[in-house]
């Protein structure tokens, strides 16, 4: 039975040209995390594998940095970066857990972080 939950940074906002850290955390399970995939809508951004380390998709290499931890740092943000991001935790023996983050990239300096929330 899958008992874990994913805590994410939730709904967040950031300024155009700035950077943001996308972070997820898997808790309430003893399952081993074998891999975390980061996706933006229907695009694979990056993968962190327990054995192989990080792979950043070539088309995002200039603007995506691995970490901290299993998180992902997006740099040189544009308004086009606004949207949903998903962290997909592949675990053994539980299976797959998915967390969702919504990022809004703002033109102005009124960017502020939303509250943390949990996805069961």
């Amino acid at each position: 039975m899958m008992t874990g939950t994913i805590e994410t940074t939730g709904n967040i906002s950031a300024e155009k040209g700035g950077s943001i850290i996308l972070q997820c955390h898997l808790s309430s399970t003893t399952a081993q995390v074998t891999q975390v995939n980061w996706e933006q809508q229907d695009q694979l951004l990056a993968i962190c594998n327990a054995d192989l380390g990080w792979h950043i998709s070539p088309s995002f290499k200039d603007r995506v940095a691995p970490g901290p931890g299993l998180g992902l740092t997006l740099q040189s943000l544009t308004v086009n970066d606004t949207g949903e991001y998903f962290c997909i935790y592949h675990t053994y023996p539980d299976g797959t857990y998915t967390g969702r983050i919504f990022l809004e990239v703002l033109e102005s300096s009124v960017a502020e972080h939303g509250a943390r929330f949990q996805i069961p």
């Epitope: 081993q32 694979l44 993968i47 054995d51 592949h90």
Partner: antibody, heavy 118, light 107 residues
Framework: EVQLLESGGGLVQPGGSLRLSCAAS????????MHWVRQAPGKGLEWVAA????????GYADSVKGRFTISRDNSKNTLYLQMNSLRAEDTAVYYC???????????WGQGTLVTVSS | DIQMTQSPSSLSASVGDRVTITCRAS??????LNWYQQKPGKAPKLLIY???SLQSGVPSRFSGSGSGTDFTLTISSLQPEDFATYYC?????????FGGGTKVEIK
């Protein structure tokens, strides 16, 4: 240089068994998921089975489930496919393949031909 | 199981032509789509992974695009060594499935 070398193919009667091996070299075998893919003569590619780096996750195509068993020996850098209750439709070239991040097949072996016929 | 439908099944083209092969998944597979080239008697070779990433060592005339259910492999200027069969493959979920292949022949 990454190399995958399959062996163990041959002619076998229906109902018989074969064990395929795939010797890996040139990379850290224990870090990669490994798969078997087959191709019947003149046909397309068909995925057969997969095993994760630590053997924690194993999967099979419905067409071979209950008859084929995938395994690996990380100390010998070798992947195996035990094939039992073979049928004529199992006739194919069998490729072993390296699958980084469980997403793409970046290296294939040269293949070994399995022919099931009476 | 996710079905992968490739079209056309075969095509004739000349050296220098722009060639487009399409692949459609029966459900959304995000960008978990790979393209392979296979020549007779040889193992397949990875060209494009994760829908649009060019595998190291593959000529830049090959490109991939698409996400969700619809994907395209484009060869911008066909070369003599490109006459082969091309397969798409999804890795979104097991069982992994391949398209039926597209044979690119000399016109």
């Amino acid at each position: 240089e990454v190399q995958l070398l399959e062996s163990g193919g041959g002619l076998v009667q229906p109902g018989g068994s074969l064990r395929l091996s795939c010797a890996a070299s040139g990379f850290t075998f224990s870090s990669y998921s490994m798969h078997w893919v087959r191709q019947a003569p003149g046909k397309g590619l068909e995925w057969v089975a997969a095993i994760s780096s630590n053997t924690g996750s194993i999967g099979y195509a419905d067409s071979v489930k209950g008859r084929f068993t995938i395994s690996r020996d990380n100390s010998k850098n070798t992947l195996y496919l035990q094939m039992n209750s073979l049928r004529a439709e199992d006739t194919a070239v069998y490729y072993c393949a390296r699958v980084p991040y469980d997403v793409w097949i970046d290296y294939w072996g040269q293949g070994t031909l399995v022919t099931v016929s009476s | 199981d996710i079905q992968m439908t490739q079209s056309p099944s075969s095509l004739s083209a000349s050296v220098g032509d722009r060639v487009t092969i399409t692949c459609r998944a029966s459900q959304s597979i995000s960008s978990y789509l790979n393209w392979y080239q296979q020549k007779p008697g040889k193992a397949p070779k990875l060209l494009i992974y994760a829908a649009s990433s060019l595998q190291s060592g593959v000529p830049s005339r090959f490109s991939g695009s698409g996400s969700g259910t619809d994907f395209t492999l484009t060869i911008s200027s066909l070369q003599p060594e490109d006459f082969a069969t091309y397969y798409c493959q999804q890795s979104y979920s097991t069982p992994l499935t391949f398209g039926g292949g597209t044979k690119v022949e000399i016109k």
